[in-house]
């Protein structure tokens, strides 16, 4: 817990270079996001193919889309689970972080020192061991979140499910109901290849209880589509006299000495005539 | 027929609880979440929350956090609203209601028959 | 919370009117649904997305409206139309109805 309220930011006087002043964590053992460069990461061949259980969610059933004041993030249903851990991990909310308009890099974890355009995260927690998201934060092995790097690229109907509301989750507070959809449709082609390491949430308190799971391939949306991310909510209550927009809501890469990510691929991405295999 | 039948309404003290159940038929009850609405009398709707019987998870109106549980049994197909620290004001018809996604939204296409609550010394 | 004012609260109107009842959100709204209720009895779905009848529902009705402004018209009123309609809205939380409004014979 935060040694004086719970007041933090991306950025001016409670930006990230604060946040362990009321968060000791923010400055301790294995934060995140990283880097990811070549040389830390090492093959693992136990690395085995996650299975993604009731992630097909009813349109039939409603999901709250929330302003949060940091993110927009959509609450989970606890029987949506990763199968393939050595827990059962449930599903309890997604959320993004991004850019701005003017320099749309806002994913969290970078490659080889390059950001993309914007990042989702699907946050689990571990079911077998605990009984809720907030009980399992502060837990050893408590956290599992997948990670998904967003470019800009062609139009993708399955964000757009999140995005078309948007408007109704303007202001910090503010909730909106989204019918269910095929959350697997978020993630990118071949989720067998990732990247696995221990690190910490990205938002204070920053607890060093996550296992990271970074799919390889990115998934594209378009220009319009990232713009409207950028460009449509705000931190503030609607009723704040000095609304600041929620853009740049990405923490810096962190500190990762002397440790290794390991990747479920060995291979390298070879150029081909059709890009990039 | 789908049916959701609601019981359990009657005279209840002020400051005391209340436990409303609605059972539902004729459809697969784990494939459409449960609501709960109320109506004072000669007033208009007025909604609760709701649960997700596939897994028990529950969102409320915010006025009634805290003090409205909603919970479910499986095995009975059977849904229930706990009210505590009851006041006069709570005094309503209590309807349970099934929403349906049709065309792009969902629209409450079942209603129970509702069961009312009187909050009297 | 998105409020929803309904008008008028009540109506007089006879038989073979046109009847015009108005739902303004606080807020804009991707959809409004109608539903109506008769004493005593629990509230039917009548209109859902601004403007499809729910089956069985008279084509003298229609539903229009986008953003905040929303209507439900009745073409021509038949006896059985008399009753209480509320406007509905699931676009935020919480979802909210407006109050009412009652037809009644003049």
């Known amino acids: 817990a935060p040694v004086n309220g719970s007041k933090w930011t991306y950025f001016g006087p409670d930006g990230e270079n604060s946040w362990s002043k009321k968060y000791p964590s923010c400055g301790g053992l294995l934060q995140s996001p990283i880097d990811l460069h070549s040389d830390i990461l090492q093959y693992d061949a136990s690395l085995t193919p996650l299975e993604f259980q009731g992630y097909n969610l009813s349109a039939n059933k409603q999901f709250l889309l929330t302003n949060n004041g940091h993110s927009v993030k959509l609450n989970l249903p606890s029987d949506m689970h990763i199968q393939g851990l050595q827990s059962r991990y449930s599903a309890t909310q997604l959320h993004l972080h991004w850019g701005n308009p003017n320099d749309p890099h806002g994913s969290e974890h970078t490659v080889s020192g390059q950001h993309f355009a914007a990042e989702l995260h699907i946050v689990h927690y571990n079911s077998d061991l605990y009984p809720d998201a907030s009980t399992a934060s502060n837990k050893s092995e408590g956290l599992a979140v997948l990670a998904v790097l967003i470019e800009m690229g062609s139009f993708n109907p399955s964000y757009d499910k999140i995005f078309s509301h948007l408007q109704h989750v303007k202001y910090k507070g503010q909730e909106a109901f989204v019918p269910g959809f095929n959350i697997e449709e978020l993630l990118p082609e071949r989720t067998a290849e990732y990247y696995r390491y221990r690190g910490s949430l990205t938002t204070p308190p920053c607890n060093p209880t996550v296992l990271w799971t970074v799919f390889r391939n990115p998934v594209q949306i378009s220009q319009e589509q990232l713009l409207a991310l950028e460009t449509a909510l705000y931190c503030t209550h609607m009723d704040d006299p000095s609304p600041r927009e929620m853009i740049n809501n990405f923490r810096q890469v962190q500190k990762f000495d002397e440790r290794l990510v390991y990747t479920s691929f060995s291979q390298v991405q070879v150029c081909t005539a059709a890009g990039l295999s | 027929e789908v049916q959701l039948v609601e019981s359990g309404g009657g005279l209840v003290q002020p400051g005391g609880s209340l436990r409303l159940s609605c059972a539902a038929s004729g459809y697969s009850y784990t494939d459409y979440n449960i609501y709960w609405v109320r109506q004072a009398p000669g007033k208009g709707l007025e909604w609760v929350g709701y649960?997700?019987?596939?897994?028990?998870?529950?969102t409320y109106n915010q006025k009634f956090k805290g003090r409205a549980t909603i919970s479910v049994d499986k095995s009975k197909n059977t849904a229930y609203l706990q009210m505590n620290s009851l006041r006069a004001e709570d005094t309503a018809v209590y309807y349970c209601s099934r929403p349906i996604y049709y065309g792009a939204y969902w629209y409450f296409d079942v209603w129970g028959q509702g069961t009312l609550v009187t909050v009297s010394s | 919370d998105i409020q929803m004012t309904q008008s008028p609260s009540s109506l007089s109107a006879s038989v073979g009117d046109r009847v015009t009842i108005t739902c303004r959100a606080s807020s804009s709204v991707t959809y409004m649904h109608w539903y109506q209720q008769k004493p005593g009895k629990a509230p039917k779905p009548w209109i859902y997305?601004?403007?499809d009848l729910i089956s069985g529902v008279p084509s003298r009705f229609s539903g229009s409206g986008s953003g905040t402004d929303f209507t439900l018209t009745i073409s021509s009123l038949q006896p059985e139309d008399f009753a209480t309609y509320y406007c509905?809205?699931?676009?935020?939380?919480?979802?909210?109805f407006g109050q009412g409004t009652k037809v009644e014979i003049k």
């Open positions: 509905q809205q699931w676009s935020s939380n919480p979802l909210t």
């Open positions: 649960i997700d019987p596939a897994n028990g998870d529950t």
């Open positions: 997305r601004t403007s």
